[in-house]
Interface confidence: low
């Protein structure tokens, strides 16, 4: 039985050219996290974090994506095309798969309202 829940940063916005952290947190379960996949709105994989073997950033994104903090993902040098949905998929044992959604809006404006907790200056 899957008892856990995924908490995410929800809907966030950030400045074009800036950086933002995508963060998901799995709570209310004792399941072991074996792998976390980060996917973009078109379902292409950005990065994978495997519990045993560490991080892999997919080649197409290696210049603009940095692993962490924690199981999160840092997007850098944001462009307007980065606007859209992002998904974290937690593969766990024995629960199975948990999935969280984040919506990122990249703004042209120099004023981007979002939680400072997840912003990198």
């Amino acid at each position: 039985m899957m008892t856990g829940t995924i908490e995410t940063t929800g809907n966030i916005s950030a400045k074009k050219g800036g950086s933002v952290i995508l963060q998901c947190h799995l709570s209310s379960t004792m399941a072991q996290v074996t792998q976390v996949n980060w996917e973009q709105h078109d379902h292409s994989l950005l990065a994978i974090r495997n519990a045993e073997l560490g991080w892999h950033i997919y080649p197409a994104f290696k210049d603009r994506v940095a692993p962490g903090p924690g199981l999160g993902l840092t997007l850098q040098s944001l462009t307007m095309n980065d606007t859209g949905e992002y998904f974290c998929t937690y593969h766990t044992y024995p629960d199975g798969t948990y999935r969280g959604r984040i919506f990122l809006e990249v703004l042209e404006s120099s004023v981007a309202e979002h939680s400072a907790r997840f912003q990198i200056p």
Epitope: Q35, I48, L53, H56, P59
Partner: antibody
């Protein structure tokens, strides 16, 4: 250019063990992971397991746990797979394959080592 | 484990023809699919990863498409060197599994 050099055919007796090598060249050995793949009788491919040459961390297909053991020697840029308690079911071609990340997809392959288990 | 089902198991085609090979995953793998070509007695060679990204040096007559559970590899204007076996493989999460293969033969 990237090269993964494997030995020629091996003939071993049932119940014995064999250790197959895979010598890497043309890239930084510790920057990529090494996978092993089985192909039986010209049929499809089965992933056996993967090892991170930097840390020695390994990960196995459940089917091959206890059958295969993966190791590396960083000093010689060589990966090894030991297969034990051999039976005729283990007769196959075994490939080493460089893994982009820890085995996601395999961008360079060794030429394969044909293992025949027969008395 | 994710099961990859490839079809057809074999097909015959002539040089210049266009062929399509399909691969179905038993669960959603998004775009995490690779295609390999293998010639008789040789090792497999990576053609496509992330469902549609061609490996460097692979001719543009090859194209991959699909996402989720349904994928295909299309070869336009078949050349003599294209004949051999083709395998799909998911790269979504361990254990990584392959399709049963498609043998492409000259008609």
């Amino acid at each position: 250019q990237v090269q993964l050099q494997q030995p020629g055919p091996e003939l071993v007796k049932p119940g014995a063990s064999v250790k197959i090598s895979c010598k890497a060249s043309g890239y930084s050995f510790t920057d990529y992971n090494m996978n092993w793949v089985k192909q039986s009788n010209g049929k499809s491919l089965e992933w056996i397991g993967v090892i991170n040459p930097n840390s020695g961390t390994d990960n196995y297909n459940q089917k091959f746990k206890g059958k295969a053991t993966l190791t590396v020697d960083q000093s010689s840029s060589t990966a090894y797979m030991q297969l034990n308690s051999l039976t005729s079911e283990d007769s196959a071609v075994y490939f080493c394959a460089r893994g982009v990340y820890f085995g996601n997809y395999f961008d360079s392959w060794g030429q394969g080592t044909t293992l025949t288990v027969s008395s | 484990d994710i099961v990859m089902t490839q079809s057809p198991a074999s097909l015959s085609a002539s040089v210049g023809e266009t062929v399509t090979i399909t691969c179905r995953a038993s669960e959603n793998i998004y775009s995490s699919l690779a295609w390999y070509q293998q010639k008789q007695g040789k090792s497999p060679q990576l053609l496509v990863f992330n469902a549609k990204t061609l490996t460097e040096g692979v001719p543009s007559r090859f194209s991959g498409s699909g996402s989720g559970t349904q994928f295909s590899l299309k070869i336009n204007s078949l050349q003599p060197e294209d004949f051999g076996s083709y395998y799909c493989q998911h790269h979504y999460g361990a254990p990584w599994t392959f399709g049963g293969g498609t043998k492409l033969e000259i008609k």
